[in-house]
Amino acid sequence: IVLRPSRVHNSEENTMRALTLKDILNGTFSYKTFFPNWISGQEYLHQSADNNIVLYNIETGQSYTILSNRTMKSVNASNYGLSPDRQFVYLESDYSKLWRYSYTATYYIYDLSNGEFVRGNELPRPIQYLCWSPVGSKLAYVYQNNIYLKQRPGDPPFQITFNGRENKIFNGIPDWVYEEEMLATKYALWWSPNGKFLAYAEFNDTDIPVIAYSYYGDEQYPRTINIPYPKAGAKNPVVRIFIIDTTYPAYVGPQEVPVPAMIASSDYYFSWLTWVTDERVCLQWLKRVQNVSVLSICDFREDWQTWDCPKTQEHIEESRTGWAGGFFVSTPVFSYDAISYYKIFSDKDGYKHIHYIKDTVENAIQITSGKWEAINIFRVTQDSLFYSSNEFEEYPGRRNIYRISIGSYPPSKKCVTCHLRKERCQYYTASFSDYAKYYALVCYGPGIPISTLHDGRTDQEIKILEENKELENALKNIQLPKEEIKKLEVDEITLWYKMILPPQFDRSKKYPLLIQVYGGPCSQSVRSVFAVNWISYLASKEGMVIALVDGRGTAFQGDKLLYAVYRKLGVYEVEDQITAVRKFIEMGFIDEKRIAIWGWSYGGYVSSLALASGTGLFKCGIAVAPVSSWEYYASVYTERFMGLPTKDDNLEHYKNSTVMARAEYFRNVDYLLIHGTADDNVHFQNSAQIAKALVNAQVDFQAMWYSDQNHGLSGLSTNHLYTHMTHFLKQCFSLSD
């Protein structure tokens, strides 16, 4: 059980107040984290509270401003990047968001040696992506879907690609589906470790069907937004990987990296690129049917002036019980010999663990093992491997950082974080300097987040980087809800849940219950993290019990649970939420006439199906930006879990798993359907089809659309959304306003 430390004493009770919705909407109780921008083994940059860019040297204890807030302000810079030779800084301004990761911006180059902006051969605007080489001060950037190279910031650019075209050919940046569902980045170019080569992806979207929606804006006529967006079963982007020698870019030009034959024989994806050395690169490919992944190690052949990917350096990863990997196929972390690597994949017992691959995957040496999962490899040095896992005390929703000594035999394992601040900190991530000389630990909870700096050899804490003192003080007179994380054992399935209880919770009383669900494949909602959010307010002020349940399909508890939903989305995720609700009712403190469910995105899909399950458990529910049919969602994501919507594959379940097919079952629940009209991700089409089916079935429901808003419903829409949902729930639960 994780109970927030209680600061409530009877004598103080009248000075304490509940959370208000305004607190949440204003972000009054938001926390800060500190991630050093490492620039060497012992130095990092950080943007100070007054917006100066400050360089800190851990070993000398000295710090100095490398870029003043005055310079930043002169071009309205919101971001910066120091060149590795420390001669230049790029300043980023005019940020304009595109999709989840992508944005365009204007870039200015500031010369630190003379304290002036570089004049002559200025960068065009707006730029889609820009980055320094890892050594020196070469620049690569993407403008109008083409890649350009500058040997020095003041030099004229060398144009690498010429075929870039809006919505057709993307060079060095991903198209919509690769950005959202495969790379999870705004870029698709990668410098080799010393900047000799530049690798990049070219995405050809010429044949992809286009999603078109209206953007209403302020004009007389709405604009139409067109995005090449492959839905399940549709034509996919065609990807090619090229590498160019940046020292002599015109000599042989970009050289294409060959695709492994077993991958190229049918539709495929490129999933990631990892440089090993300047002359060795590792590419990962994935069949369109995403249960086969191939890792291909390629070497530069000087005699060919191109890249050789011998079959002996192809490593196949295949899943026979589900899809390859977790959410994504894991990426390799290479060791110092530049050929062997560490990688997380399922062991024979179906738990994701670190393996060491020297020659073949079949001969992989398992480094970690147990009925828990290794989650991320942070860094491999010559004598240590740092990783995170949820091993400690068998709580899947925790994250601790471990060090395995690989320099000695047998390797020994040490938990770096398990006992540091045990009550406060059970969910960590880490950020390492070069050669892991130092590292920062960022603790996300369950207590107030704290960021600390540590010595990479001894693990000794050097200093606190951010401890959120102001937040701690602000919360002193707030009645926060209690939180507990426990598990239910049902039919050989373990259902972990988090329950958020009103501050004066009394087990002998009855409380309305709200289920918050996401439930997507390889997700995790039950995590030991700190949050003061909308559901905290509902528990604190409105006296609701809120529960989050990780059912089948969720992550980090083994493949049996994860792959249970393979090819049948919308079945077990819903069943497990319902099962959990029944168990909560048995606990005796839930008012079974006042149970609601809500979710966003995949959670909106699950909440809709739960409401339409015909169990009579739920009085009401909310779906925000739900998927309503898997035929409407992106190919890369959907097909990973569902296969293809074809007769000879899985069309039947595509049809059976729609929300629309259950329209009749909404008759006995109060349903609030919400969607942004400019949702590029889960298209408004999804909710439009639900609404149409409900109208055709003559079922009453409530709905709210947010004009010109995307999947995130940000800005003023957020305030309106949570206010509207609060009213809906209070009405459903007969709570006075």
Epitope: Y248, Y251, V252, E256, P258, V259, A261, A264, R301, E302, D303, W304, Q305, T306, D308, C309
Partner: antibody, heavy 120, light 111 residues
Framework: QVQLVQSGAEVKKPGASVKVSCKAS????????IHWVRQAPGQGLEWMGW????????KYAQKLQGRVTMTTDTSTSTAYMELRSLRSDDTAVYYC?????????????WGQGTLVTVSS | EIVLTQSPGTLSLSPGERATLSCRAS??????????MHWYQQKPGQAPRLLIY???NLESGIPDRFSGSGSGTDFTLTISRLEPEDFAVYYC?????????FGQGTKLEIK
């Protein structure tokens, strides 16, 4: 036009060293790999290794490793091949050859050859 | 290393005839992009001369009666109509893997 001109014939005693030169002209010397290939009397061709004058990259045939050294002088556009600890079976015509730009391993221009005789 | 075996060792033909020379590799010398096999002609007392590169590409200045074909492990050099100056030794060479290797040669002689 591209030309590779090699140094003259040499007679060496077993255990001695020989250094053959290959002067290039008619193209940018630093752009193309120079290969060294030898041919024993009445025998076939044997690849000895390569040197890239631009990058300094060198690859030697395993069987000659430790006995052969390839170098270049970019100021004179000349490549050199030195073979040490000579044995009688090193008697051969030694050729330098230019790596074809787009040939990816083919050799498009060859020197006239240098006969090295190893005899006591 | 990759061993190249040429056949026949000697080929006796008359001018005007068609010559077919074969080269077999001990393992594939092809990738999805190219076949890394090249052909040379050598006359007595002369350096080799490049005829065909990457299995089928005719080097500039070489008469088009010379052609190359094949992929994987089996390659062929064809001379469609023999001219008197074509009688020489022909070598195949692979650059798929280091070390580069040559075949032992096929001697094309006048019948």
């Amino acid at each position: 036009q591209v030309q590779l001109v090699q140094s003259g014939a040499e007679v060496k005693k077993p255990g001695a060293s020989v250094k053959v030169s290959c002067k290039a002209s008619g193209y940018t010397f630093t752009e193309n790999i120079i290969h060294w290939v030898r041919q024993a009397p009445g025998q076939g061709l044997e690849w000895m290794g390569w040197i890239h004058p631009g990058s300094g990259s060198i690859k030697y045939a395993q069987k000659l490793q430790g006995r052969v050294t390839m170098t270049t002088d970019t100021s004179t556009s000349t490549a050199y091949m030195e073979l040490r600890s000579l044995r009688s079976d090193d008697t051969a015509v030694y050729y330098c050859a230019r790596h074809a730009g787009t040939g990816r391993g083919a050799m498009d221009y060859w020197g006239q050859g240098t006969l090295v005789t190893v005899s006591s | 290393e990759i061993v190249l075996t040429q056949s026949p060792g000697t080929l006796s033909l008359s001018p005007g005839e068609r010559a077919t020379l074969s080269c077999r590799a001990s393992q594939s010398v092809s990738t999805s992009a190219y076949s890394y096999m090249h052909w040379y002609q050598q006359k007595p007392g002369q350096a080799p001369r490049l005829l065909i590169y990457l299995a089928s590409n005719l080097e500039s200045g070489i008469p088009d009666r010379f052609s190359g074909s094949g992929s994987g492990t089996d390659f062929t050099l064809t001379i469609s109509r023999l001219e008197p100056e074509d009688f020489a030794v022909y070598y195949c060479q692979q650059s798929r893997e280091l070390p580069y290797t040559f075949g032992q040669g096929t001697k094309l002689e006048i019948k």
